[in-house]
């Protein structure tokens, strides 16, 4: 058993049918010595008396808020949560496996630049009685500070018969140098509590590996005289690290017909302009990627050809 | 990205082309190592990230873009002295900081060159003959060093009398390649920045 926060405790259970569970001793936070009784949750049934209460925690019915009283007055509370270990592996019932970029990915994180700021998000089908708390650091043995905000519900989607809820959090490394070569990964730890179930999820990454630039901005077309060709131009996104001559991007320019089946013409360039043939009803899209370290491509910025 | 990259104009900053080749070569070598050594811990998640140049050179600090020198988190400067003549500087007036930066890059390349050559000698003794260093990568390191053209003491190639542990050597190869790729990215950024300056 360990303390998650004041008066909230996590009991770790080896979870299998007929498991013996864990013996837990609760102590009433009071100078009083006698006349103390214990109850669980809203029940008025007295579970025991005395300053300590010994219980055998086996299943969720044994978890909850234990309260000690004296003469109708509440003295203190202890909330017991359960953390299930199933055949040596901690349960992952609360969050959905996003399966991207690989199986068992519960937390996904992205950064728009090298400033040390990043966003993580996760999915669940649970709508109520759900709380999250997020901590982060650079490295784990001698951790350096990363400050995270509160997790917030950022999107709701309908998936088949189910509703899916997306939560996200923003974090900022306390003293980040955009040009630094990372040798210790960022660690993100999310505590999830659903009713009386506790779970924790972790992700470990280098900022360089989670970079996804914003799409190029100010995408414009300039028709070339007496030609079907157009000059496409764009700019680096505002959120990208500066100076741009150091944090350079490379770009992919795509001409896509109305039909998805039509052949796509693609050009790769390090410049912020390109000359392409603009077909009728086609659209031109441009996306960006770090020129020197191949992490994710940005989403496409698009303009119609007409 | 496996697309052809245009060869720079002759008037361009001379080292830019070599640094681009370097990044391409080390990235290819790392990819090859990951595939060939799939049963070894060779992914970024599995290896220890060690920097053989730590406390010996200070490339990131010495080569910091002017715009980032206001960022206190970037000014972790270490006192290191370098020789300051080099042919990449020949065609332009350069500050002491730029000379320091390029000589730091040269020292990095020299250290990695020695490590890679020593390691290749061990890998050539492996009866499994599983992986060797790409000669192209070694040649590209050499070319960039020549373009930088700093006079510096030659570091003798390390020789070891004891029987090599091939498992450890291959893991060390992965560690070195990951670190060298990160340094090659920094070198490319620096050359691009200097070219634009």
């Amino acid at each position: 058993i360990w303390e998650l926060k004041k008066d909230v405790y996590v009991v770790e259970l080896d979870w299998y049918p007929d498991a013996p569970g864990e013996m837990v001793v609760l102590t009433c936070d009071t100078p009083e010595e006698d006349g103390i009784t214990w109850t669980l949750d809203q029940s008025s049934e007295v579970l025991g008396s005395g300053k300590t209460l010994t219980i055998q925690v086996k299943e969720f019915g044994d978890a909850g808020q234990y309260t000690c009283h004296k003469g109708g007055e509440v003295l203190s509370h202890s909330l017991l949560l359960l953390h299930k270990k199933e055949d040596g592996i901690w349960s992952t019932d609360i969050l959905k496996d996003q399966k991207e970029p690989k199986n068992k990915t519960f937390l996904r994180c992205e950064a728009k630049n090298y400033s040390g700021r990043f966003t993580c998000w996760w999915l669940t089908t649970i709508s109520t009685d759900l709380t999250f708390s997020v901590k982060s650091s650079r490295g784990s043995s001698d951790p350096q500070g990363v400050t995270c905000g509160a997790a917030t519900l950022s999107a709701e989607r309908v998936r088949g018969d189910n509703k899916e809820y997306e939560y996200s959090v923003e974090c900022q490394e306390d003293s980040a140098c955009p040009a630094a070569e990372e040798s210790l990964p960022i660690e993100v730890m999310v505590d999830a509590v659903h009713k009386l179930k506790y779970e924790n999820y972790t992700s470990s990454f280098f900022i360089r590996d989670i970079i996804k630039p914003d799409p190029p901005k100010n995408l414009q077309l300039k028709p070339l005289k007496n030609s079907r060709q157009v000059e496409v131009s764009w700019e680096y996104p505002d959120t990208w690290s500066t100076p741009h001559s150091y944090f350079s991007l490379t770009f992919c320019v795509q001409v896509q017909g109305k039909s998805k089946r039509e052949k796509k013409d693609r050009v790769f360039t390090d410049k912020t302009s390109a000359t392409v043939i603009c077909r009728k009803n086609a659209s031109i899209s441009v996306r960006a990627q770090d020129r020197y370290y191949s992490s994710s491509w940005s989403e496409w910025a698009s303009v119609p050809c007409s | 990205r496996n697309l052809p990259v245009a060869t720079p104009d002759p008037g361009m900053f001379p080292c830019l082309h070599h640094s681009q080749n370097l990044l391409r070569a080390v990235s290819n070598m790392l990819q090859k190592a990951r595939q060939t050594l799939e049963f070894y811990p060779c992914t970024s998640e599995e290896i220890d990230h060690e920097d053989i140049t730590k406390d010996k050179t200070s490339t990131v600090e010495a080569c910091l873009p002017l715009e980032l020198t206001k960022n206190e988190s970037c000014l972790n400067s270490r006192e290191t002295s370098f020789i300051t003549n080099g042919s990449c500087l020949a065609s332009r007036k350069t500050s002491f900081m730029m000379a320091l930066c390029l000589s730091s890059i040269y020292e990095d390349l020299k250290m990695y060159q020695v490590e890679f050559k020593t390691m290749n000698a061990k890998l050539l003794m492996d009866p499994k003959r599983q992986i060797f260093l790409d000669q192209n990568m070694l040649a590209v390191i050499d070319e960039l060093m020549q373009a930088l053209n700093f006079n510096s003491e030659t570091v003798p190639q390390k020789s070891s009398l004891e029987e090599p542990d091939f498992y450890k050597t291959k893991i060390k190869l992965c560690i070195l390649l990951h670190a060298f790729r990160i340094r090659a990215v920094t070198i490319d950024r620096v050359m691009s920045y200097l070219n634009a300056s």
Partner: antibody, heavy 115, light 111 residues
Framework: QVQLVESGGGVVQPGASLALSCAAS????????MHWVRQAPGKGLEWVAF????????YYADSVAGRFTISRDNSKNTLYLQMNSLAAEDTAVYYC????????WGQGTMVTVSS | QSVLTQPPSVSGAPGQRVTISCSGS????????VKWYQQLPGTAPKLLIY???QRPSGVPDRFSGSKSGTSASLAITGLQAEDEADYYC????????????FGTGTKVTVL
């Protein structure tokens, strides 16, 4: 006393369907994940499928994915395996098993696919 | 096809010590715990070892398990006639959990 009893096995022709059941007793069935594992005659153990405690997620071996469906009815304390498009290589003893460090197995039910 | 490899058979005289190996990789045994089962002819598998080296109550201390790196082993000391059975190791893969990975199985013969 934890008990698992499989039923529904039998002899069927290739291409046919069969539904297996596993009746659970002696524990809170709705709290635990459940597996189906099979064993072809004279061969080793092969995992078939898993379902979470609340039925929210199911996982399958590649060899049965798209043909077999694992499900559960927690109100009836019963685990099911619906097997469609059966082939000769599905011939095996099918066991249901609890998920956990200490597991409980049923006695098994024989499925024979033969023309 | 099983990714946990066991020797097809091992044998020993009564009273001898035999060991069965179970070889995997970093993503399975290297990252997860190992179980061992005994299966007597015509019966369901019986759990012998869990969490690499733990014995459930009722399993004789002649059976012991261990794990090192990407492989595990089961040792039977003081071999007895009733130990003649098939033995299977089981683990998980970190990317396909909760799919059970079983070993290829080892037939133990008491000479």
């Amino acid at each position: 006393q934890v008990q698992l009893v499989e039923s529904g096995g039998g002899v069927v022709q290739p291409g046919a369907s069969l539904a297996l059941s596993c009746a659970a007793s002696g524990f809170t069935f709705s709290s635990y994940g459940m597996h189906w594992v099979r064993q072809a005659p004279g061969k080793g153990l092969e995992w078939v499928a898993f379902i979470r405690y609340d039925g929210s997620n199911a996982y399958y071996a590649d060899s049965v994915a798209g043909r077999f469906t694992i499900s559960r009815d927690n109100s009836k304390n019963t685990l099911y395996l619906q097997m469609n498009s059966l082939a000769a290589e599905d011939t095996a003893v099918y066991y249901c098993k609890t998920h956990g460090s200490h597991d409980n197995w049923g006695q098994g039910t024989m499925v024979t696919v033969s023309s | 096809q099983s990714v946990l490899t066991q020797p097809p058979s091992v044998s020993g005289a009564p009273g001898q010590r035999v060991t069965i190996s179970c070889s995997g990789s970093r993503s399975n045994i290297g990252s997860n715990t190992v179980k061992w089962y005994q299966q007597l002819p015509g019966t369901a598998p019986k759990l012998l070892i869990y969490y690499n080296d733990q014995r459930p109550s009722g399993v004789p201390d002649r059976f012991s398990g261990s794990k090192s790196g990407t492989s595990a082993s089961l040792a039977i000391t003081g071999l007895q006639a009733e130990d003649e059975a098939d033995y299977y190791c089981q683990s998980y893969d970190r990317y396909t959990h909760p799919a059970l990975l079983f070993g290829t199985g080892t037939k133990v013969t008491v000479l």
